[in-house]
């Protein structure tokens, strides 16, 4: 460590010999007093009136209170101007001033970089009274200095509402380089250049930077801080760090991993959550993203059927949530389902394929040749039909649903009947006379109710009319249903 000291003629001579703790410019003597966490302005008590603090601002007094004698200007003695020391060392420095005893109340405060140091710092003030003057030495000590202690320290003394300010004592705490910016982990595209930044400060300056990639020095010649390293591209993951060197030694940054973006791993654990006749709800667990965020996913669906042409249906969906409802599927069919996801680099491989089945659907066609006629003697309506030509996917026929609507003089009533799958005829009781009965029939499977047949109408006359001619739905391709009364 180095100290700088200036000695000048004293404006107001004190004592023939040095005072304890003052005017010492050798460095060792400046590293003594202990230090607490806060700073405290020195409170100085008059040697003539113990217990009573001096008050007032620094002034340049010219005249005594009697107004008879001209006094030289008051000023702090020059002392060490610059103290350079290493981090964690102790330091002590002081201000000294000789004050004529005519001034009763004075205070000395310590300031750093323009701010008063308040609190419980180790500031100690000693008094050395004489007949005409009192020598005051204000000492400031810091133990285990840190970089934050760097700065310009001054003493201020108030006398007669004026201020006397000392020359600054500049404390420079030197240590190993301190990083203000370190390289950061990144995910980069293969064989594409990118930059890393490293910045470190002293004191002491300059700070030189060396870059290290996978334990090999990138620049054998140092670069002044801050340094930007252009990495010309990577084909595989690499670890980078930077070394900051100054006259005190070397500090190494954290090592950062630079990953190479790649296509994602395939999704795993594709699961079936719900199946209906025409849709399947699936979920999956995304694979590793390849150090690049997922953009979207693709659900691939193949029908497992020797007679199918093996074509693949592709449904694109967002990457999250990891769930998709596949629609527009055939009922009672087997499917093989796989999922692939993509990031900016490309598509993953397809997940392991899973098998899933849709449930049976409702019939897609209505019963044929629906015939309706009135059996007046029994006061009911006979209905006959032919079993529909249902596809296998519709599942097993479990019965029929018959809708009959009775309309007469402004009233309308719909009734539903269920009949078993073995039937191809049914009888329903006449509900209203002098009314129109409209009959429709739908086939029913476990998958649901199919479409209703075209309506067949029959007129139910008042009691006494007899007409056994049926009403019926035409065979496919015939004209509209005929209403026979």
């Amino acid at each position: 460590a180095i100290t700088e000291a200036r000695e000048e003629a004293k404006p107001y001579p004190l004592f023939p010999g040095p005072l304890p703790g003052s005017l010492q410019t050798d460095h060792t003597s400046l590293l003594s007093l202990p230090h607490t966490s806060g700073y405290q302005p020195a409170l100085m008590f008059s040697p003539t009136q113990p217990g009573r603090p001096y008050t007032g601002n620094v002034a340049i007094p010219r005249v005594t209170s009697a107004g008879s004698k001209l006094l030289p200007p008051l000023a702090f003695k020059h002392t060490v101007g610059h103290i350079i020391l290493s981090e964690h060392k102790d330091v002590k420095f002081n201000c000294s001033i000789s004050v004529p005893n005519i001034y009763q109340d004075t205070t000395i405060s310590w300031w750093k970089d323009g701010k008063e140091l308040l609190g419980a710092h180790h500031a100690i003030t000693q008094f050395y009274p004489d007949d005409e003057v009192t020598a005051i030495i204000a000492s400031f000590s810091i133990t285990s200095v840190q970089r934050s202690d760097n700065g310009s320290y001054i003493c201020k003394m108030k006398i007669n509402n004026e201020e006397i300010v000392s020359d600054p004592i500049y404390i420079e705490v030197q240590g190993l380089p301190h990083f203000t910016k370190q390289p950061e982990s990144m995910n980069v595209t293969r064989n594409t250049a990118f930059n890393l930044t490293c910045q470190a400060v002293g004191p002491p300056e300059p700070v030189n930077i060396f870059w290290v990639q996978n334990s090999s020095r990138v620049n054998e010649q140092p670069e002044k801080s801050p340094s930007v390293l252009t990495v010309p591209g990577l084909t595989e993951m690499a670890v980078f760090s930077c070394e900051a060197h100054n006259d005190k030694g070397l500090t190494v940054s954290k090592g950062v991993q630079i990953n190479i973006k790649a296509i994602p791993s395939p999704p795993t654990e594709v699961s079936i959550h719900n199946s209906t006749a025409h849709s399947i709800l699936i979920s999956w667990v995304p694979g590793f993203d390849g150090y690049s965020p997922f953009r979207n996913c693709s659900v691939q669906v193949k029908e497992v059927d020797p007679l199918s042409n093996g074509s693949v249906m592709i449904f694109n969906t967002s990457a999250s949530p990891h769930m998709y409802q596949i629609k527009q599927l055939q009922a009672l069919a087997n499917y093989s389902i796989g999922v692939s996801c993509m990031n900016e680099i490309g598509w993953s491989a397809v997940s392991p394929w899973i098998l899933a089945s849709t449930t049976e659907g409702a019939p897609s066609v209505a019963p044929l040749n629906v015939t309706v006629f009135l059996n007046e003697s029994r006061d009911n309506v006979d209905i006959r039909w032919m079993k529909p030509l249902t596809k296998r996917q519709a599942g097993e026929l479990v019965g029929y649903r018959i809708s009959h609507v009775w309309q007469s003089a402004g009233i309308s009533k719909e009734l539903l009947e269920e009949v078993g799958q073995n039937n191809s005829r049914a009888q329903i009781s006449v509900q209203v006379h002098n009314a129109t009965c409209t009959v429709r029939i739908a086939a029913v499977t476990k998958g649901g109710v199919g479409p209703f047949s075209d309506p067949v109408k029959i007129f139910i006359p008042a009691h006494g009319w007899v007409d056994h001619a049926p009403s019926s739905t035409p065979a496919p391709g015939n004209a509209d249903p005929v209403l026979i009364i």
Partner: antibody, heavy 118, light 106 residues
Framework: QVQLVQSGSELKKPGASVKVSCKAS????????LSWVRQAPGQGLEWMGW????????TYTDDFKGRFVFSLDTSVSTAYLQISSLKAEDTAVYYC???????????WGQGTLVTVSS | DIQLTQSPSFLSASVGDRVTITCRAS?????MHWYQQKPGKAPKLLIY???NLAQGVPSRFSGSGSGTGFTLTISSLQPEDFATYYC?????????FGQGTKLEIK
């Protein structure tokens, strides 16, 4: 533009010394290291080592420790290669090359032929 | 020291041909650089850091590889490409060169 200009060919007797110069221009001399590369007649390239132009510290590869000295005069942006106690097998073209990050020799001098013959 | 082995050592080819020169390292390296040298001339940087074209180098030159295996490819040989090519590794000191590949006109 970046240029490295080397001194001319030298014919020396065995046991003598030679000093080859390499003058750099077109860039800040102390920002890049300076390497030396040897090429014996009809042979490939051999990296001899380099000198840190910022600190002046030379680094030699194992085969070039002892009789070979790298030095600098930064005031004239010049690097030097001195070979003492010359032997016949030192006959070669000696190249200086600017040495940048990742050990890239991005600019080369034109080469200096040193012939050692009695 | 890391040994670099170039293959082939000699290569005869015609203008317009596509040629590939291989450089194999005795252990894994970080990057490979490639230089071109014509008779009586200094080497010239061609490709640095495995795959980056040096300034002014035509795009018919390309480089690839990682670990211990690297290649220099010239997609369509031009008359001015007939020269000797050297690979040089970065990743382990001392830096070493391959023994060279001499590309001759067939």
């Amino acid at each position: 533009q970046v240029q490295l200009v080397q001194s001319g060919s030298e014919l020396k007797k065995p046991g003598a010394s030679v000093k080859v110069s390499c003058k750099a221009s077109g860039y800040i001399f102390t920002s890049y290291g300076l390497s030396w590369v040897r090429q014996a007649p009809g042979q490939g390239l051999e990296w001899m080592g380099w000198i840190n132009t910022y600190s002046g510290v030379p680094t030699y590869t194992d085969d070039f420790k002892g009789r070979f000295v790298f030095s600098l005069d930064t005031s004239v942006s010049t690097a030097y290669l001195q070979i003492s106690s010359l032997k016949a097998e030192d006959t070669a073209v000696y190249y200086c090359a600017r040495y940048t990050n990742y050990g890239v020799f991005d600019y080369w001098g034109q080469g200096t032929l040193v012939t050692v013959s009695s | 020291d890391i040994q670099l082995t170039q293959s082939p050592s000699f290569l005869s080819a015609s203008v317009g041909d596509r040629v590939t020169i291989t450089c194999r390292a005795s252990s894994s390296v970080g990057y490979m650089h490639w230089y071109q040298q014509k008779p009586g001339k200094a080497p010239k940087l061609l490709i640095y850091a495995t795959s980056n074209l040096a300034q002014g180098v035509p795009s018919r030159f390309s480089g690839s590889g990682s670990g211990t295996g690297f290649t220099l490819t010239i997609s369509s040989l031009q008359p001015e490409d007939f020269a000797t090519y050297y690979c040089q590794q970065w990743g382990s000191l001392p830096f070493t060169f391959g023994q060279g590949t001499k590309l001759e006109i067939k």
